[in-house]
């Protein structure tokens, strides 16, 4: 048993059948000594008395806030929450599988540039009694801050017959140093609580590889005299780090017919400006990515052709 | 160049070597991002190659202030991945393919190194370890790593060339 | 819990073959080499050989000849044989971990030791 | 092969007071590509196996004091007890792991004068 936050505890669980449970003991938070009695959630019934409450904790039953009382009055709470483990594996019940970029992915981050700044999110099935807490580091065996901001609930998107929750969370390194190669990984720890069920999630990444630019700005064509090319020009994205000189992005820029089934004409160049072809009812869409470290594209921008 | 006393290096021939790096390094070894290998108790390995550091002064206020400190790292750091891609950890079984860019990536390193010292200057004499033996199946992990570093590393000197060939070339 | 233990014949006759075992549990063979050390009594730490994580081994050139260090990785056990046994090989003798990685590294966790005494 | 020179071979000092030991290698420990000193300090107390204290030169173990620090680089090295402990009156030995064969120094006394 280990203390969550105050008064909140979380009792491990290995989850078989006729698993012997977990004995706990729990203390009233209390100077009385004498007529203290314990009861567990909205029950009157009467657990136990004296300081101290042995109970063996087997299942969800067993879990839940135990309140001391004297004479009526509430003395201190307890709540506990179970924390399973199912063939030496604790469980994922509360959030989804995203399975990308690979399997038993629970929580993905992305950051915009290289200012320390991230953004983490996670999809669950649950719509209520569900509370999340983040926190990060930069490294495990001597961790340097991250500040992350309060869970927040992002998206709600129909699936079939169920409904999928997206919550999100930004994060900020402390000490962020854009220009230096990351040595150590950034951590990220959520602990996920759904009624009397707790969880925790895992992310370890560094900076650089979960880079996704935002889509080029200001994406303009000027037609070029007596001819069917037009010059495309672009700009770096606001959200991308400066100065553009040392934080240098590549591009690609695709020609693309009305129909998926045209054939996309690419160019790739580090310049903010290209020359295509363009057809008719066709788009110009130009995507970013980091010139020297090959981490995600962005998003096209595009533009139609006529 | 990059000379005692601080004189520039060639810094749009240093672009281009480290551009070329950083293109090799990703064609030597193309698995973007998240095969994560932090999960094979990569610690050590990562904390055993060079880094680029904040106080390493390789930042665009730094290489304004003074590009040296950042370009004898980036040689330090050139230095010592090209003795790893010459050990045996690359050379040994299983051999490397006839086309691997891991050849030419080395050769890139050398050539970007002696860019940045060229005859009769020396910077302290690089010494580098005695490499623990490995076997062919710790050979593949640990190439696995050492690109995946490298990979990072000449990102940044690309950025420093880069910067340096727009903002402090002659 | 980290743990090395060893055993091993503490008393030998002058030509014969010493031989120790070094059981290791709490961590796993594919990340760490085993080393032995030896210290003759009031005197220093002289390092004896490895045995690396994938199997080879490496001495001290002046054991080489007649050391032999070896792994049964069923049983997470390492032995040292040392040969031709003479007076100089009165010595302490520890088993210690280092952690596999692109160099060679330092000893973090010994074996209790073991005292081999050789005398006729 | 790296040779550890260590001095002074004893250190005559009372509880409290401050204790420094040098580390002397043949040739440089110092690896610059990745800013790493090869070099390890431990201690023995009769009848033990030696304890890790630092590593990489500077970096305490974990669960050692903090009056235990590691300094140097290169070729010069030292251990420092910032205000000697009781306990702390053992042999201290450096170990080089740069080159192998790993080698030791030859081991300082610090006695309770």
């Known amino acids: 048993i280990w203390e969550l936050k105050k008064d909140v505890y979380v009792v491990e669980l290995d989850w078989y059948p006729d698993a012997p449970g977990e004995m706990v003991v729990l203390t009233c938070d209390t100077p009385e000594e004498d007529g203290i009695t314990w009861t567990l959630d909205q029950s009157s019934e009467v657990l136990g008395s004296g300081k101290t409450l042995t109970i063996q904790v087997k299942e969800f039953g067993d879990a839940g806030q135990y309140t001391c009382h004297k004479g009526g009055e509430v003395l201190s709470h307890s709540l506990l929450l179970l924390h399973k483990k199912e063939d030496g594996i604790w469980s994922t019940d509360i959030l989804k599988d995203q399975k990308e970029p690979k399997n038993k992915t629970f929580l993905r981050c992305e950051a915009k540039n290289y200012s320390g700044r991230f953004t983490c999110w996670w999809l669950t099935t649950i719509s209520t009694d569900l509370t999340f807490s983040v926190k990060s580091s930069r490294g495990s065996s001597d961790p340097q801050g991250v500040t992350c901001g309060a869970a927040t609930l992002s998206a709600e998107r129909v699936r079939g017959d169920n409904k999928e929750y997206e919550y999100s969370v930004e994060c900020q390194e402390d000490s962020a140093c854009p220009a230096a190669e990351e040595s150590l990984p950034i951590e990220v720890m959520v602990d996920a609580v759904h009624k009397l069920k707790y969880e925790n999630y895992t992310s370890s990444f560094f900076i650089r590889d979960i880079i996704k630019p935002d889509p080029p700005k200001n994406l303009q064509l000027k037609p070029l005299k007596n001819s069917r090319q037009v010059e495309v020009s672009w700009e770096y994205p606001d959200t991308w780090s400066t100065p553009h000189s040392y934080f240098s992005l590549t591009f690609c820029v695709q020609v693309q017919g009305k129909s998926k089934r045209e054939k996309k004409d690419r160019v790739f160049t580090d310049k903010t400006s290209a020359t295509v072809i363009c057809r008719k009812n066709a788009s110009i869409s130009v995507r970013a990515q980091d010139r020297y470290y090959s981490s995600s594209w962005s998003e096209w921008a595009s533009v139609p052709c006529s | 160049r990059a000379v005692p006393g601080g004189s520039s290096p060639a810094w749009t021939q240093c672009q281009q070597l480290s551009q070329k790096l950083c293109t090799l390094a990703w064609s030597a070894h193309p698995l973007v991002g998240h095969m994560d290998l932090r999960e094979e108790g990569d610690e050590e390995t990562t904390n055993d190659v060079p880094h680029i550091q904040c106080g390493d002064g390789c930042d665009p206020q730094g290489l304004r202030d003074n590009s040296q400190f950042c370009l004898q790292r980036i040689h330090q750091g050139l230095i010592f991945y090209e003795k790893l891609l010459g050990s045996d950890i690359f050379t040994g079984e299983p051999s490397l393919l006839p086309d691997s860019p891991v050849g030419q990536l080395h050769a890139s390193l050398l050539g970007l190194s002696q860019l940045l010292q060229p005859e009769g200057h020396h910077w302290e004499t690089q010494q580098i370890p005695s490499l623990s033996p490995s076997q062919p199946w710790q050979r593949l992990l640990l190439r696995f790593k050492i690109l995946r570093s490298l990979q990072a590393f000449v990102a940044v000197a690309a950025r420093v060339f880069a910067h340096g060939a727009a903002t402090l070339s002659p | 819990e980290v743990q090395l233990q060893q055993w091993g014949a503490g008393l030998l006759k002058p030509s014969e073959t010493l031989s120790l075992t070094c059981a290791v549990y709490g961590f796993s063979l594919i990340s760490y080499n085993v080393h032995w050390i030896r210290q003759p009594p009031g005197k220093g730490l002289e390092w004896i050989g490895v045995?690396?994580?994938?199997?080879?081994?490496d001495y001290n050139s002046v054991l080489k000849s007649r050391v032999t260090i070896s792994v049964d990785t069923s049983k997470n056990q390492f032995s040292l044989k040392l040969s031709s046994v003479t007076a100089a090989d009165t010595a302490v003798y520890y088993c210690a971990r280092d952690k596999y990685g692109l160099f060679p590294g330092y000893f973090d966790y010994w074996g209790q030791g073991t005292l081999v005494t050789v005398s006729s | 092969e790296i040779v550890l020179t260590q001095s002074p071979a004893t250190l005559s000092l009372s509880p409290g007071e401050r204790a420094t030991l040098s580390c002397k290698p043949s040739?440089?420990?110092?690896?610059?590509?990745?800013?790493?000193?090869?070099l390890a300090w431990y201690q023995q107390k009769p009848g033990q196996a030696p304890r890790l204290l630092i590593y990489?030169?500077?970096t305490r173990q974990s669960g050692i004091p903090d009056r235990f620090s590691g300094s140097g680089s290169g070729t010069d090295f030292t251990l420092t007890i910032s205000r000697l402990e009781p306990e702390d009156f053992a042999v201290y030995y450096c170990l080089q792991h740069f080159n192998y064969p790993w080698t030791f120094g030859g081991g300082t006394k610090v006695e309770i004068k």
């Open positions: 040739q440089s420990l110092l690896s610059s590509g990745n800013r790493k000193n090869y």
């Open positions: 045995i690396w994580t994938g199997g080879s081994t």
């Open positions: 990489y030169a500077s």
